[in-house]
């Protein structure tokens, strides 16, 4: 008996079609994606083929204005325009509070959305009751398939679940769930889940009874042959882990941001053993026409996204310096404002030891790309914060050690004074440079905010312990020249959008009056 | 071969009630959604109930809600239709008719043969 | 509720002829469109799903197109067995409606 699964995971509310690279289409004839041109590709092939199945591995939520505005809203619709068979929730469906995951989502979906690892309690438990499962058994053609979904646990660090979520441990979790399905007479089973490619291969090493992984959260491209765009391949698809048990586990991921659709045909025995798996991410690129019926829906949705982007966010009663003159150069508030943003949409009170689990960011200054002027009545609108932050990125979580940041630090003046982007804009950062050292030893102090304290204060940097920082997902895969950050990092997440985030911070606080205030310094 | 066979149909006064049946083989009958459908004499298709897969939903036309109830027995590969208050216009040809697998709204590929119902004083 | 207008309400053709039947919804319906080919006395049998797939066992002379609102059955060359009538029917969101059909007859 064969399935066609194919797969999405971490789209990110690119609904409309992108660019090669993710970002805003500029040039139609060149762009990608969408759900438009999904919804023709995934009918080609339900049209073809008897046993289908369309899944979705998690973070949808979050990545462009369309999430800003419609909050989840265009996830269920579109998703349920394109007939999704089951989800499984990501760290983002959380960004705006289990009651943002729950109304817009949870409600409207007519496809099941899943995670074994997540538990409810208190009120909460019976309020979500029912409206996310474990797993869920759907029939396809004569027989039925198990689908187990999961998260990552790390999700309370990443986004917004509250106190009444609990994030278990996902093979811990997992495992009852596959024996309850395995008691139904399931003997074939797939795991959909969001924790990263390399909890996806420990499920499939691990989980008794899994016989497919489809993943999420580390974008993850997997391609065999010669891959058709830019991405490069971290392994063959599907990848094959070997199960303590014996068993030959495919596991696949299909990159992000809707640019491919995985396409994975699996071969079962009577027994529901997996006895062959193949195929490949397709890349949705132009040669796939996009449906006339999704596009006009899409263009109706649309309007809504113009009118938003005039819009008064807040007020801003100083000049914000974006130029590249000042954030190339020295601190600029800009960079501030960009930073001060970036911790508070990472608050978190994790426990009664720390303050919060983060407090340092990092932001190139060629990443800035204009000022805002507050003479214009001081208003800011998307459509400004658009023009400071283009390119469409996410400020983003990782984990680095001390010596790793103190290189960071070395090559943001490694050639200072030539206007290049490297220079870093900080938050939570005490740095003073000398120029007249000579490059790579030109750090001669390094304060960083402590979490582990009621009252924060800067301590020296120490080279051996591990820092969690906010920056530009740029930054996290060594652009600018951060090699070091990409080699070196122990953990990264991806965080929410960097217009979203500022535009958030800006909206909440009002009136904001950003100042340059001695966070990097010249001796 | 996949088959659906319709029974229960015959002549009933107004007011009345009628139960239908339909018996379902060859295929996994509690993987498939479920329908009715029904075609009054020299008239069209009119479509009357769905019944999901995993009974968890079913959907009626607003002109037999609350009169008909559509319901299933996946043990025994049967599909019903309960009709109370029977009216005149409710007179047709009743199909069962297979739908698709999931919770979305779905086409028929199998259809069966049809049973005559006709609501007469 | 999504209103299916089919036109022509009939037709006469000849054996061979080329028949084109449309149906137009009173909102988009993607490609949610069924055609179906009844006989008289006869159950209604499926010929094509998502608007333009051919039912398995279905004769390639019967083709379907469309999207959106506006969909078209074709019968390239229509063979005596094809004088029938014949229904669209949309599964975009309930309830489920048909179109009044094309009876197609011979000229």
């Known amino acids: 008996w064969e399935l066609t699964i194919l797969h999405t995971n971490d789209v990110h509310s690119r609904l409309e079609q992108t660019s090669e690279d993710s970002s805003k289409c500029v040039n139609a004839s060149r762009c990608m994606g969408g759900v438009a041109r999904l919804f023709t590709k995934v009918q080609q092939i339900r049209r073809a083929e008897p046993n289908v199945l369309l899944l979705d591995a998690g973070d949808q939520y979050q990545g462009t204005i369309w999430f800003t505005v419609y909050k989840g809203a265009e996830v269920a619709h579109f998703m349920n325009a394109l007939r999704y068979d089951a989800m499984a929730l990501g760290n983002h469906e959380f960004d705006n509070g289990v009651e943002g995951l729950i109304e817009p989502l949870l409600k409207e979906a007519k496809f099941p959305i899943l995670s074994a690892n997540i538990k409810a309690k208190g009120p909460l438990a019976s309020q979500i009751s029912g409206l996310y499962l474990p797993y869920k058994v759907l029939p396809v053609g004569d027989e039925v398939v198990g689908i187990v979904g999961y998260t990552s646990k790390e999700t309370p660090f990443l986004s917004n679940p509250g106190t009444n979520l609990v994030f278990e441990d996902e093979i811990t979790a997992l495992q009852p769930e596959v024996d309850k399905l395995k008691t139904l007479n399931v003997n074939k089973i797939i795991a959909l889940g969001h924790s990263g490619f390399e909890t996806d291969k420990l499920i499939a090493q691990k989980v008794r009874g899994v016989d497919v992984v489809v993943g999420g959260h580390s974008n993850t491209f997997l391609y065999t042959g010669n891959p058709p765009s830019k991405e490069v391949p971290a392994g063959k698809y599907p990848f094959i882990v070997t199960s303590d048990d014996g068993r030959k586990v495919p596991v696949v991921q299909a990159y992000a941001f809707g640019k491919y659709l995985g396409y994975l045909k699996i071969e079962f025995d009577e027994r529901g053993n997996v006895i062959s798996s193949h195929g490949n991410p397709i890349l949705l690129n132009s040669s796939i026409p996009e449906d006339p019926s999704i596009k006009a829906d899409i263009n109706k949705w649309r309007i809504k996204l113009d009118n938003y982007s005039t819009q008064e966010l807040g007020k801003t009663i100083v000049y914000l310096d974006g130029s590249s003159q000042s954030c190339r150069f020295r601190e600029c508030n800009m960079g501030n404002l960009i930073c001060d943003a970036m911790i508070n949409n990472n608050l978190r009170h994790a426990d009664e030891m720390f303050w919060n689990h983060v407090s340092m960011c990092i932001l190139n200054g060629g990443g800035i790309r204009s000022p805002i002027d507050e003479r214009n009545n001081g208003t800011i609108t998307w459509e400004n914060l658009a023009a400071v932050l283009p390119f469409g990125g996410t400020f983003d979580l990782v984990q680095l050690k001390g010596s790793t940041l103190k290189k960071a630090f070395e090559h943001s003046v490694h050639r200072y004074g030539q206007s290049t982007g490297e220079f870093l804009q900080v938050g939570g950062i005490h740095v003073v440079y000398d120029l007249s050292r000579k490059p790579g030893d030109r750090v001669v102090k390094l304060d960083v905010l402590c979490t582990k304290c009621r009252v924060p204060s800067y301590d020296p940097l120490k080279m051996d312990e591990i820092y969690k920082v906010i920056l530009p997902n740029f930054l996290a895969n060594g652009g600018d020249g951060f090699q070091m950050i990409k080699d070196e990092l122990l953990r990264h997440d991806s965080g929410d959008q960097d217009i979203n985030v500022v535009s958030t911070y800006i909206s909440k606080m009002k009136v904001i009056y950003p100042a340059v205030e001695g966070r990097i310094k010249f001796s | 071969q996949v088959q659906l066979v319709e029974s229960g149909g015959g002549v009933v006064q107004p007011g009345r009630s009628l139960r239908l049946s339909c018996a379902a083989s060859?295929?996994?009958?509690?993987?498939?959604?479920m329908h009715w459908v029904r075609q009054a004499p020299g008239k069209g298709l009119e479509w009357v109930a769905v019944?999901?897969?995993?009974?968890?939903?079913?959907y009626y036309p607003d002109s037999v809600k609350g009169r008909f109830t559509i319901s299933r027995d996946n043990s025994k590969n049967t599909l019903y239709l309960q009709m109370n208050s029977l009216r005149a216009e409710d007179t047709a040809v009743y199909y069962c008719?297979?739908?698709?697998?999931?919770?979305?709204?779905?086409?028929?590929?199998?259809w069966g043969q049809g049973t005559m119902v006709t609501v007469s004083s | 509720d999504i209103q299916m207008t089919q036109s022509p309400s009939s037709l006469s053709a000849s054996v061979g002829d080329r028949v084109t039947i449309t149906c137009r919804a009173s909102?988009?319906?993607?490609?949610?469109l069924a055609w179906y080919q009844q006989k008289p006395e006869k159950a209604p049998k499926s010929l094509i799903y998502a608007a333009s797939s051919l039912q398995s066992g279905v004769p390639s002379r019967f083709s379907g197109s469309g999207s959106g609102t506006d969909f078209t059955l074709t019968i390239s060359s229509l063979q005596p067995e094809d004088f029938a009538t014949y229904y669209c029917?949309?599964?975009?969101?309930?309830?489920?409606?048909f179109g009044g059909g094309t009876k197609v007859e011979i000229k």
């Open positions: 019944i999901w897969y995993d009974e968890s939903n079913k």
């Open positions: 909102q988009g319906i993607s490609s949610w």
């Open positions: 060859g295929f996994t009958f509690s993987n498939y959604g």
């Open positions: 029917q949309q599964y975009n969101s309930y309830p489920l409606t």
């Open positions: 008719a297979r739908g698709g697998s999931s919770w979305y709204p779905d086409s028929f590929d199998i």
